[in-house]
């Protein structure tokens, strides 16, 4: 698992729609793999965290002034859709094949 | 200023190229406004932090399981270029009008 000391990476995050109160309109699935981006953005930033120039700059400034400037943050840089069965306005069960931006495809340092 | 208790926002971050060791190839400017994204991504996520669906989900899961799942992170969501004067391979001072991704244009919760 990606602890605080580990590098930025994608980790498992199973989300149950009942837990977040979305079961009132999402019929299925009951839960899904959302993933989570966890870990630190440490110097030097590796290519696999696809750092922007700003993230590189911020990392270097943090290295010099750690109390003044924070590190870059490990966040989703690419998201994937999931398919959901939901109730429309008329209460009709409807399948949405691509419910965008629900699951992490890639993590990076930003 | 945006402390830990404040909401995600863009704050000033003046970067001196000498401080980060880039003065060896960037001739001018000597420093620039990079900005930094600071503050928390608290529930409910406001429209101005342009949250993705995943960020909304993660925020809701964090609300229910704060020790298991982290909050979404306040990061640059749009970057701007700056202009820099640098030396090319022949040592000729050359202006790059659009050195992309160097300054924060917008922050958001991801």
């Amino acid at each position: 698992s990606a602890g605080a000391g580990s590098h930025c990476q994608k980790t498992s995050l199973r989300v149950n729609f009942e837990d977040i109160g979305w079961d009132s309109w999402i019929i299925a699935p009951k839960e899904y793999e959302a993933y989570e981006c966890k870990g630190g953005c440490f110097f030097p930033l590796a290519d696999d965290v696809t750092p922007t120039k700003h993230a590189i700059v911020q990392t270097l400034v943090h290295l010099k002034f750690p109390t003044k400037v924070g590190k870059a943050c490990c966040v989703p840089t690419k998201l994937s859709p999931i398919s959901v069965l939901y109730k429309d306005d008329m209460g009709v069960p409807t399948l949405k094949y691509h419910y965008e931006g629900m699951s992490v495809a890639e993590c990076g340092c930003r | 200023s945006a402390g830990a208790g404040s909401h995600c926002q863009k704050t000033s971050l003046r970067v001196n190229f000498e401080d980060i060791g880039w003065d060896s190839w960037i001739i001018a400017p000597k420093e620039y406004e990079a900005y930094e994204c600071k503050g928390g991504c608290f529930f409910p996520l406001a429209d101005d932090v342009t949250p993705t669906k995943h960020a909304i989900v993660q925020t809701l899961v964090h609300l229910k399981f704060p020790t298991k799942v982290g909050k979404a992170c306040c990061v640059p969501t749009k970057l701007s270029p700056i202009s820099v004067l640098y030396k090319d391979d022949m040592g000729v001072p050359t202006l790059k009008y659009h050195y992309e991704g160097m300054s924060v244009a917008e922050c958001g919760c991801r």
Epitope: - | P29, V84, P93, L95
Partner: antibody, heavy 119, light 111 residues
Amino acid sequence: EVQLVESRGGLVQPGGSMRLSCAASGFTFSNYWMNWVRQAPGKGLEWVAHIRLKSDNYATHYAESVRGRFTISRDDSKSSVYLQMNSLKTEDTGIYYCTGGSNYVFAFWGQGTLVTVSS
Amino acid sequence: DIVMTQSPDSLAVSLGERATINCRASESVDNYGISFMNWFQQKPGQPPKLLIYAASNQGSGVPDRFSGSGSGTDFTLTISPLQAEDVAVYFCQQSKEVPWTFGQGTKLEIK
């Protein structure tokens, strides 16, 4: 070693034409803006024209004093730049320098060639 | 066009002393935090040579006795200590806007 060698200038009558050429070596010619800068006898320096890169569609710019009369061109395959001068005036007399550089500075200079416009 | 005006037109300084040449632009030649100001040296019978670029940076192979300063509209070239081989005409030049323009030149001689 960077070298810019201008063709020989000479004497031309007012209203006449002359073509200058400049052969470059010692640097990647196609990566640099090329310019002509002139200097009237005992006077200061005056930028005449420049031509940018292929990626800029070889855009050209001219000093107001020569616009419509002078044409700058380049041949990257020959590492050469040219200045076609038409409708020459006595005030065009001077040393013409071929210069190469960036979008910021005149970095490389030729030795110059003297153009004299006189009847 | 941006007009560059140098002062003085000529200058005589003793060997080992400091020579100061000023250049004023008709409008600011700064943009993006960069000064679009260069200095050239021209010795008799030779083409100009880049001395200082971006107001304060030395060109390749330029001795440390040459320094530049200034921003906006007012710039200075300083030569210290002056040596015999520094006898030349010095030109300031802006590259902020086309047409790129030069100052009229300052002739430096030994007193």
